[in-house]
């Protein structure tokens, strides 16, 4: 008996071939001997089966001795043995219909788990193997689970169902809802305007939710909410904003915040959270602000940085086009009695300059 695997919702075509290459009498029946369809001369006739409105054939093939049965919009319960009767012969085809669905929504928050459930006909014993967009393979029976979804899990999951040495492939599009970056750091000189951007790693037709930026300044003992906002169909509206600093927010995606000027008291780390409508949990992005200040007080030239810097960052003071006068893995460096000229304060990581501030030292007469 020939076995054919089908996918729920799809169309399947079961073949039936006569030895003569001409249109002759045929009919398809199910295992209960109920007629599905057949022919009357060159016309198609249908029987009283449950498939009535979903069954069809290809009359253009009848003259070739081919009498296919097409079943549209397959259901699990269409799994059955179908019998084609032609030329006093019976051709049997066993159809097994499978369905594979994601547990709830195919749009899941980063860190959530994905469960894929296989619907299969009674008596079948299929195995399932799924391959994630990043090439990770998972195997299972009726259910497959992936915990702690990552951004790289976004995309098309390809799942193969195996039964009776036959296979059927399912493709499921999964969208992991997350920010493009888990964390970002902005380096600014004192007084400069600061731009914070929070691009999303996904695109959806309508995006609705609410968000908040909490800020922990390095100099402050506790964190405070800098801004709260709503998101409606990709339009951003500010609900509440602190007076100091007075942040501005863009009205369109990507989420964009502007701090009028970088000041040492603002240096620190923030956490932007976004709660999406009809989703449990929140999206998070950490943002860090490092502020640099170079000052000259009497005979002391000082360079300082505030904010979350890594211990391997180097802070240097140097006269333009000369070797560094001072270079330390600290958050403040100074030079006493600096010679006249343009001095540079540099914050660097393995030789790569992250932040630079210039200060002119005038000659003393």
């Amino acid at each position: 008996k020939k076995v054919v695997l089908g996918k729920k919702g799809d169309t399947v075509e079961l073949t039936c071939t006569a030895s003569q290459k001409k249109s002759i009498q045929f009919h398809w029946k199910n295992s209960n001997q109920i007629k599905i369809l057949g022919n009357q001369g060159s016309f198609l006739t249908k029987g009283p089966s449950k498939l009535n409105d979903r069954a069809d054939s290809r009359r253009s093939l009848w003259d070739q001795g081919n009498f296919p049965l097409i079943i549209k919009n397959l259901k699990i319960e269409d799994s059955d043995t179908y019998i084609c009767e032609v030329e006093d012969q019976k051709e049997e085809v066993q159809l097994l219909v499978f369905g594979l669905t994601a547990n709830s929504d195919t749009h899941l928050l980063q860190g959530q788990s994905l469960t894929l459930t296989l619907e299969s006909p009674p008596g079948s014993s299929p195995s399932v193997q799924c391959r994630s967009p990043r090439g990770k393979n998972i195997q299972g029976g009726k259910t497959l689970s992936v915990s702690q979804l990552e951004l790289q899990d976004s995309g098309t999951w390809t799942c193969t169902v195996l039964q009776n040495q036959k296979k059927v492939e399912f493709k499921i599009d999964i969208v992991v809802l997350a920010f493009q970056k888990a964390s970002s750091i902005v380096y600014k000189k004192e007084g400069e305007q600061v731009e914070f951007s929070f691009p999303l790693a996904f695109t959806v037709e309508k995006l609705t939710g609410s968000g908040e930026l909490w800020w922990q300044a390095e100099r402050a003992s506790s964190s405070k909410s800098w801004i709260t906002f709503d998101l409606k169909n990709k339009e951003v509206s500010v609900k509440r904003v602190t007076q100091d600093p007075k942040l501005q927010m863009g009205k369109k995606l990507p989420l964009h915040l502007t701090l009028p000027q970088a000041l040492p008291q603002y240096a620190g780390s923030g956490n932007l959270t976004l709660a999406l409508e009809a989703k449990t949990g929140k999206l998070h992005q950490e943002v860090n602000l490092v502020v640099m200040r170079a000052t000259q007080l009497q005979k002391n030239l000082t360079c300082e940085v505030w904010g979350p810097t890594s211990p391997k960052l180097m802070l240097s003071l140097k006269l333009e086009n000369k070797e560094a006068k001072v270079s330390k893995r600290e958050k403040a460096v100074w030079v006493l009695n600096p010679e006249a000229g343009m001095w540079q304060c540099l914050l660097s990581d393995s030789g790569q300059v992250l932040l630079e501030s210039n200060i002119k030292v005038l000659p003393t007469w």
Partner: antibody, heavy 119, light 107 residues
Framework: EVQLLESGGGLVQPGGSLRLSCAAS????????MSWVRQAPGKGLEWVAS???????FYADSVKSRFTISRDNSKNTLYLEMNSLRAEDTAVFYC?????????????WGQGTTVTVSS | DIQMTQSPSSLSASVGDRVTITCRAS??????IAWYQQKPGKGPKLLIH???ILHPGVPSRFSGSGSGTDYTLTISSLQPEDFATYYC?????????FGQGTKLEIK
Amino acid sequence: EVQLLESGGGLVQPGGSLRLSCAASGFSFSNYAMSWVRQAPGKGLEWVASINEWGSTFYADSVKSRFTISRDNSKNTLYLEMNSLRAEDTAVFYCSRHYGGSYDPMDYWGQGTTVTVSS
Amino acid sequence: DIQMTQSPSSLSASVGDRVTITCRASQDINKYIAWYQQKPGKGPKLLIHYTSILHPGVPSRFSGSGSGTDYTLTISSLQPEDFATYYCLQYDNPLQTFGQGTKLEIK
């Protein structure tokens, strides 16, 4: 002999409506799926809509929800109701018969009727 | 939806020449391809269906072949009446799609 004769074409303004008819003869009309296919000036053929012998309908994405295909088996006539017409709907519309059902190719075609959408 | 890519878009040949037109489907169409001939101001005429079956009345110089996604129409020896535009059609499902057409002109 299979014959298909389209009518109802003409000039219509954007946003307007038109109803095309196709009178069929020479075959058992009710036993065949029928289609409308169009051809914009100087362009190729584009399948528009089909209706099978049981009355199930199928549409191209470009016309879905704007065009309606129907049939009157007692009059051996196929129809295409076209609403919210656009300039890009300007074309010769052909009525065609399928070899059998909607899973078969089209084997006979009419001579076409011209639809012009312009202000 | 299945896309059909037909090539070439135009072709110049002489009477007696052998010509080949190809169609590539965006997915496997299980041999459900038909070929049509259209002359200016006329409706198309079916030449071949199910890849290689000649429609009654079509001369045997027309032939078709292919499987999977790649299909060809061949005219073994061009006759004056064969200069026309040719289209492929996939009918694997009821949402049928045509190729862009190949205009066959006299060289």
